[in-house]
């Protein structure tokens, strides 16, 4: 009789996570009598996956009924495959004995598990930055196999090129993770902008996964300040307006100072949004000219999003307002629109308007 051979026809099998894997094995002879066992790996540390003779293997089913007469098909089906099941599986014939003796092994079948990447999670900077600054966004996805994966970054639909990507681990593993960091230069128009991390993998059938982050979480658009005086009213009161424009986020506190003394403090709330996502706010202060002997220095002080205050001063010339008259008002704008803030690279920017 011919010598028994154990045939594992497939060198490799690839299965999607969650599916069943069929590992084929046939013997070429009924002789010698004895059971088949399946192992993952070789050597003393090999793992028993299925034994025809004994044991409980809830996820493994023999493809052919083991009690079938003259059975030489020892293929098995492993259910609910996970990346942890990846490895090389050996079908091993034993000769009946006390105990049974290992006789011959098949050549092995490598099981690779196709596992989908997790939904990409995009995280932005911990602190906000202003226009012209570069911020970093990180995208992470885990648990995929095989290792080959493609990651792209987009800002408002335009592909970005300034990013660095790593896939870990570098060596062989049951599953892999990807981490990519993109550098994005902010502009004042980015409140409504979005960055998208797109991951393509063989398991996704051409339908990539996307993770997004809104630049509104990363950007701060400092306000412009303008203080103006309306015409004198008949009751000797001057209406001074502080216009705070094009700022984001909404978190803003405005304080009026009269000759350096706090007159009123207001907090911005429920402001309508501009088309570009920024906000405007206007505050008025009525100054009773007749109550002052000297010129009044008004300061509109704005503290935006926890940053150092920005001041805009304005002098109301009392001498220009005869107490008995309600016309020919004159005022002089002596202030500067100082927009000071300290940013990441420690430079000071001074804007004068």
């Amino acid at each position: 009789e011919e010598e028994l051979q154990v045939i594992q026809p497939e060198k490799s099998v690839s299965v999607a996570a969650g599916e069943s894997a069929t590992l084929n094995c046939t013997a070429t002879s009924l002789i010698p009598v004895g059971p088949i066992q399946w192992f993952r790996g070789v050597g003393p540390g090999r793992e028993l996956i299925y034994s025809q003779k004994e044991g409980h293997f809830p996820r493994v089913t023999p493809v052919s009924d083991p009690t079938k007469r003259n059975n030489m098909d020892f293929s098995i089906r492993i259910s609910n495959i996970t990346p942890a099941d990846a490895g090389t599986y050996y079908c091993v014939k034993f000769r009946k004995g006390s105990p049974d003796v290992e006789l011959k092994s098949g050549a092995g079948t490598e099981l690779s598990v196709r596992a989908k990447p997790s939904a990409p999670v995009v995280s932005g900077p911990a602190v906000r930055a202003t226009a012209e600054h570069t911020v970093s966004f990180t995208c992470e996805s885990h648990g995929f196999s095989p290792r080959d994966i493609t990651l792209k970054w987009f800002k408002n639909g335009n592909e970005l090129s300034d990013f660095q990507t790593n896939v870990d681990p570098a060596g062989k593993s049951v599953s892999y993770s990807i981490r990519s960091t993109a550098r994005v230069v902010l502009t004042r128009r980015d409140v409504h902008s979005q960055v998208i991390c797109e991951v393509a993998h063989v398991t996704l059938q051409g339908d990539p996964l996307r993770g997004t982050a809104n630049l509104s979480e990363a950007i701060r658009v400092p306000p412009f300040l303008e203080v103006t005086q309306q015409s004198m009213r008949a009751d000797n009161q001057v209406n001074v307006t502080c216009q705070v424009t094009k700022f984001y986020p909404q978190r803003l506190q405005l304080t009026w100072l009269e000759n350096g003394n706090v007159s009123r403090t207001e907090m911005a709330s429920a402001l309508p949004e501009n088309k570009d996502g920024t906000y405007n706010w206007t505050s008025w202060l009525l100054v009773n000219v007749s109550a002052h002997r000297d010129d009044v220095k008004l300061t509109c002080q704005v503290e935006h999003d926890g940053q150092p205050a920005v001041n805009k001063s304005f002098s109301v010339k009392v001498s220009a307002h005869p107490k008995e008259q309600g016309s020919n008002t004159a005022a002089e704008n002596t202030g500067t629109n100082e927009r000071d803030y300290k940013d990441d690279d420690d430079k000071h920017h001074h804007h004068h308007h």
Epitope: L30, V33, Q52, D65, T67, R69
Partner: antibody, heavy 119, light 110 residues
């Protein structure tokens, strides 16, 4: 180590029934056929029937088809052979045997159960 | 049904001598290149023990003085050099279809 442990000896009256048990250990009970064979005193071996514990498929020797019933309890890995309408010539040692190679052979045997039918 | 006839019914052989037992089937027990004949040894008060499977293959733990041969309908069990512990009754069995046994051959020492 494969072991088949059979129930103890029985004495029965003609016309009665007997149920012999065979408890298997040391292997996966549902993966191998169980055969039943009997041997009358001083006589040869006579095959009665076989059962597949995984699905209770059975094959009977025509001589015993109407009187013998094979069953299994997979929860306890036990096979049973019931023989009805006993006659004196049913006096014999009844063996269970496991087929390890699915060749319809008998690789491992129990020690036997003596059933005596006498009025 | 296939009937198996063993010969002789009994046999006496000197220690160290060859013992030969024959088994003839009423029709071929061969299928797919295999001969479905099995040989058993039964000693007094013990269950039978499988010696040979598929006509010529020695079961685990069986001394190699035992051998089996034959094909189709005619089969032989040979003990090349009889030992005292070989005294027993020997049975052939087929499984070409449902199993049957031969009537047995009693082997004694001369």
């Amino acid at each position: 180590q494969v072991q088949l442990v059979q129930s103890g000896a029985e004495v029965k009256k003609p016309g009665a029934s007997v149920k012999v048990s065979c408890k298997a250990s040391g292997y996966t009970f549902t993966n191998y056929w169980i055969n039943w064979v009997r041997q009358a005193p001083g006589q040869g071996l006579e095959w009665i029937a076989m059962i597949d514990p995984s699905d209770s498929e059975t094959h009977y020797n025509q001589i015993f088809k109407d009187r013998a019933t094979l069953t299994t309890d997979t929860s306890t890995s036990t096979a049973y052979m019931e023989l009805r309408s006993l006659r004196s010539d049913d006096t014999a040692v009844y063996y269970c045997a496991m087929d390890y190679g699915s060749l319809y052979a008998m690789d491992y045997w129990g020690r036997g159960t003596l059933v005596t039918v006498s009025s | 049904d296939i009937v198996l006839t063993q010969s002789p019914d009994s046999l006496a052989v000197s220690l160290g001598e060859r013992a030969t037992i024959n088994c003839r089937a009423s029709k071929s027990v061969s299928s797919s290149g295999y001969n479905y004949i099995f040989w058993y040894q039964q000693k007094p008060g013990q269950p039978p023990k499988l010696l040979i499977y598929l006509a010529s293959n020695l079961d685990s733990g069986v001394p190699d003085r035992f051998s089996g041969s034959g094909s189709g309908t005619d089969f032989t069990l040979t003990i090349s050099s009889l030992q005292a512990e070989d005294v027993a009754v020997y049975y052939c069995q087929h499984s070409r279809d449902l199993p049957t046994f031969g009537q047995g051959t009693k082997l004694e020492i001369k």
